[in-house]
């Protein structure tokens, strides 16, 4: 496969964020903007949050675990301790008024997640307008499922539990065909959930593929030795195409499709990304070295989270070498076209220009949004800034940038996207939108020569390096 | 780095008592759900016991009202103990810890074990 990637080029990093320090969201003027950007427009988002939404904010503690997950349905949910609040977030002609309901997940030892809460809706378009029209199911982690066939009856909803010995940790809750879910543990076992009008939810297992690890039951694998306790294939992330009906995983070692009808599903292939990938990574962040050889044993790679768009699967991906001084964890996004039966061979790699200092792995917390499927424009982003790039796959490119939500108080809950446009929840300043100004998009082939032209100021925040090494990698903080 | 160090298994008499212990470091404590499993060579691993966030706690039915699990958050150790043992309780126990992280993901980690042994 080719690998391409990017010229080691920054755009500006230095500017700090003008974010209010105020802990509790405000929204005095619809729209306003929210923190200084060079080539982005950073704005609220929406009409004003609900007041249930702006409580839960407000009297959550600092070290409360607030989750969110926002639906390309245009509904937002809000997971603050046992509750559950989800609101629709893109106003239409239909809705004039937000909708806004509470609901009581089930109890749980674990935290509650928004991972663990997925929406479906009845209207084929993937939206709805109306609590009537929107189904939901939650999970938590030990596998208690509760379920309401309508968001318009808080108090109409069914039980089960998924029974795997207490083996197993969920991760991911996913909405799929046919008003279906799949639950996913952190072990990669996958569950479809099936409602049916009697109120029973149906489950069953996903098939895996034959004659792989990965579908290997735990009782035989452990009489040959495969697995010891701690070395379980982890879980990063989960993508259904509503499309192509077809469901993907994303683990430490492989990517797994699955194709999916109404109450069935075909395990379509495992594909073994250490052995696809980690070469393309590597020469595309270390290539250069002279002592290429020598390095390429000594690296790490972590698959974090996986999206798509128009020219397929995004995976991304850190990289980092122990011996570097100093030690850079390198994002980079991967993009692999899916044949249907199996994965392409031409693989494109973009090394973003985000590049943190390496602490642990247990920091590298990274996720991708990816919000218009027509284009290659995707957001990195963790709990302190937005880091805006591309997949390197097209014609025209937006400038790199990291948008900082660093004032006090403030944190990145999640993100998400509603109708192409990208959607930051910040527990300061609730949804915000990331929109590029007018005339910002620029050739890809030009990127050098105009970050190059470019002149900051002797007082200027703003910054601009030319580099060609990987070695002259300017240190971003985290 | 994510530590978890599990002592206090043994060998010992049926209807003996051990108490296991799981010291932990890199994690805040108070905010882990620890579980304590068992592996017996060719079976599958069996959660034993968990210790939630609230403090709650929960047992496999093959252990309740013999084995009780408790935490320490200032010393970071979790503590499983063991008592009416009997020979088919034996097995390496091994200390899990679950941590909720940055946007709610989960973040698993495990300890080498600690083997009990029961005799009849």
């Known amino acids: 496969g080719s690998a391409v990637s990017s010229p080691v080029l920054f755009s500006p990093v230095g500017r700090r964020s003008s974010l209010s320090s105020r802990g509790t969201p405000t929204r005095m003027f619809p729209h306003h903007s929210i923190t200084e950007s060079v080539n982005y427009d950073v704005k609220t988002f929406g009409s004003s949050l609900p007041v249930k939404v702006m409580e839960a904010l407000t009297l959550a503690e600092v070290d409360d675990q607030l989750t969110i997950n926002i639906d390309e349905g245009g509904w937002a949910c809000l997971v603050c301790k046992e509750k559950l609040i989800i609101w629709k977030i893109a106003l239409s002609p239909i809705t004039k008024l937000s909708v806004c309901k509470e609901l009581q997940l089930p109890p749980s030892d674990f935290h509650w997640s928004a991972d663990l809460v997925a929406l479906s809706y009845s209207s084929p378009s993937g939206e709805a307008h109306s609590t009537q029209a929107v189904a939901v199911m939650v999970a938590t982690r030990e596998g208690s499922i509760r379920y309401w066939p309508s968001l318009a009856g808080e108090d109409t909803y069914t039980e089960a539990f998924v029974d795997s010995g207490g083996d197993k940790t969920y991760s991911f809750l996913t909405a799929v065909q046919g008003g279906s879910f799949i639950l996913s543990s952190s072990g990669s076992q996958l569950i479809r959930l099936i409602p049916e009008s009697s109120g029973k939810i149906h489950q069953h297992i996903l098939p895996q593929g034959q004659g792989m690890l990965s579908g290997i039951g735990r009782k035989v694998s452990s009489l040959f030795g495969i697995l010891s306790p701690s070395s379980d294939l982890t879980l990063s992330s989960v993508l259904w195409d509503r499309e192509r009906s077809s469901f993907y995983s994303l683990t430490s070692s492989n990517i797994s499709k699955w194709e999916l009808d109404d109450s069935s599903e075909k395990h379509a292939y495992s594909w073994d990304i250490n052995r696809a990938l980690k070469e393309n990574i590597t020469d595309a962040i270390w290539g250069s070295e002279s002592n290429y050889e020598a390095i390429k044993e000594g690296v790490n790679i972590r698959y974090l989270d996986l999206k798509q768009n128009c020219d397929g699967l995004v995976i991304l991906a850190a990289a980092w070498h122990s011996a570097d001084n100093p030690c850079l964890i390198y994002y980079s996004l991967i993009t692999i076209e899916d044949n249907g039966c199996q994965m392409s061979d031409a693989v494109t790699v973009e090394v973003t220009q985000y590049n943190p200092p390496f602490q642990s792995e247990d920091l590298i917390l990274c996720q991708l949004t990816v919000p218009n499927f027509s284009n290659q424009t995707a957001y990195l982003y963790n709990e302190s800034a937005v880091y805006v790039c591309s997949t390197g796959t097209g014609k025209f490119s937006l400038p790199q940038e990291k948008i900082v939500f660093n004032a006090q108080g403030d944190s990145v809950l999640g993100a998400g996207a509603c109708g192409g446009v990208p959607i930051i929840f910040s527990r300061n300043s609730g949804l915000v939108s990331i929109t590029s100004r007018e005339n910002v998009s620029i050739l890809a082939e030009d990127l050098e020569g105009s970050l190059a032209s470019s002149v900051a100021g002797p007082n200027s925040e703003s910054m601009i390096f030319e580099t060609t090494t990987k070695n002259e990698t300017i240190a971003q903080e985290d | 780095q994510v530590q978890l160090v599990e002592s206090g298994g043994g060998l010992v008499q049926a209807g003996g008592s051990l108490r296991l212990a799981c010291a932990t470091s890199?994690?805040?404590?108070?905010?882990?759900?620890m579980d304590w499993y068992r592996q017996i060579p060719g079976k599958q691993r069996e959660l034993v016991a968990r210790?939630?966030?609230?403090?709650?706690?929960t047992y496999a039915d093959f252990v309740k009202g013999r084995f009780t699990v408790s935490r320490e958050n200032e010393n970071n150790t979790v503590y499983l103990q063991m008592n009416s043992l009997q020979p088919e309780d034996a097995g390496l126990y091994v200390c899990?810890?679950?941590?909720?992280?940055?946007?709610?993901?989960?973040?698993?980690?495990w300890g080498q074990g600690t083997q009990v042994t029961v005799s009849s």
């Open positions: 899990k810890a679950a941590v909720t992280g940055v946007f709610g993901r989960l973040s698993e980690h």
């Open positions: 890199g994690i805040l404590l108070s905010k882990a759900v």
């Open positions: 210790t939630g966030i609230r403090d709650s706690a």
